[in-house]
Amino acid sequence: ASTGETPNLGEVVVAEVGWDALKLNWTAPEGAYEYFFIQVQEADTVEAAQNLTVPGGLRSTDLPGLKAATHYTITIRGVTQDFSTTPLSVEVLTASGLNDIFEAQKIEWHEGTHHHHHH
């Protein structure tokens, strides 16, 4: 559910990519949300998404427990009371395991019809 009363999220960026984890950063208005709801979905599988929540005061979180060299779609929503923002999504390929931390090989965030590509 989305509402005009709920301010939307700003931007979401994958800051660090490892072989089994990554770090997600995002922007959002201060004090706007009780928590952020994040879904980590392995691309091209029917496996259930890994769901996690982050307190509303944070703008960054680690996402552990991922597979190496795997495409993931990460979706984040801000939640307050009975409302949720329009989701923002990022697509990322985890590192192959040869190095601990790689730059994101492909990061994409989209909200509605807007698409931004970072390489």
């Epitope: 769901n51 552990p64 427990g65 009371q81 409302f83």
Partner: antibody, heavy 121, light 107 residues
């Protein structure tokens, strides 16, 4: 003050299903996850699954996947846990809980009073 | 699912003893880890959240610590009312998981 009130004790036959309800009052319902936790006699706590009503989709522990269905009715602030293909090992106390962490960051955890489900032929 | 391995499964101790219970996660968790006390016939009661934050109203003899995959609950001076079963719960990554429990009995 949040209260979680569960439905009453049930006695079921093996192979049947049971549906336990958990009505929340005294706080926002939709954006806070409700979990289901069970405890067999003399055994430990087992997290079965949880749901955030605003999103509708539930998460389940692997052990219960395919046999448990967790739903929520936002209009009545009630969560439900249905367990099918019951066997004697499902005899347990079933708790609903609003647990700190997963879609809840308040100062307290809240638990229902527990519902005893007995599976016996 | 993340496995939470709790040890010991039971222990005998005397009033005044210092007791430490350990929980190991099968992979790194996001430090959304709590400790619960349960007495027979009662719902669990949370003692510690976010690894080391003390629940309001819980005596300061209870403390939590650790990070990554290894976490501890310490009771600095065991009191008669502390004889109970203790569980850890990771609730940062779904599905959530409890440890198997540690029963603290009177020696």
């Amino acid at each position: 003050q949040v209260q979680l009130v569960q439905s009453g004790a049930e006695v079921k036959k093996p192979g049947s299903s049971v549906k336990v309800s958990c009505k929340a009052s005294g706080g926002t319902f939709s954006s806070y996850a409700i979990s289901w936790v069970r405890q067999a006699p003399g055994q430990g706590l087992e997290w079965m699954g949880g749901i955030i009503p605003i999103f509708g989709t539930a998460n389940y522990a692997q052990k219960f996947q395919g046999r448990v269905t967790i739903t929520a009715d936002k209009s009545t602030s009630t969560a439900y846990m249905e367990l099918s293909s019951l066997r004697s090992e499902d005899t347990a106390v079933y708790y609903c809980a609003r647990l700190y962490g997963y879609a809840y960051y308040g100062a307290f955890d809240y638990w229902g009073q527990g519902t005893t489900v007995t599976v016996s032929s | 699912d993340i496995q939470m391995t709790q040890s010991p499964s039971s222990l005998s101790a005397s009033v005044g003893d210092r007791v430490t219970i350990t929980c190991r996660a099968s992979q790194s968790i996001r430090n959304v880890l709590g400790w619960y006390q349960q007495k027979p016939g009662k719902a669990p009661k949370r003692l510690i959240y976010d690894v080391s934050s003390l629940q309001s109203g819980v005596p300061s003899r209870f403390s939590g610590g650790g990070s990554g995959t290894e976490f501890t609950l310490t009771i600095s001076s065991l009191q008669p009312e502390d004889f109970a079963t203790y569980y850890c719960l990771q609730n940062g990554l779904q599905p959530a998981t409890f440890g198997q429990g540690t029963k603290v009995e009177i020696k």
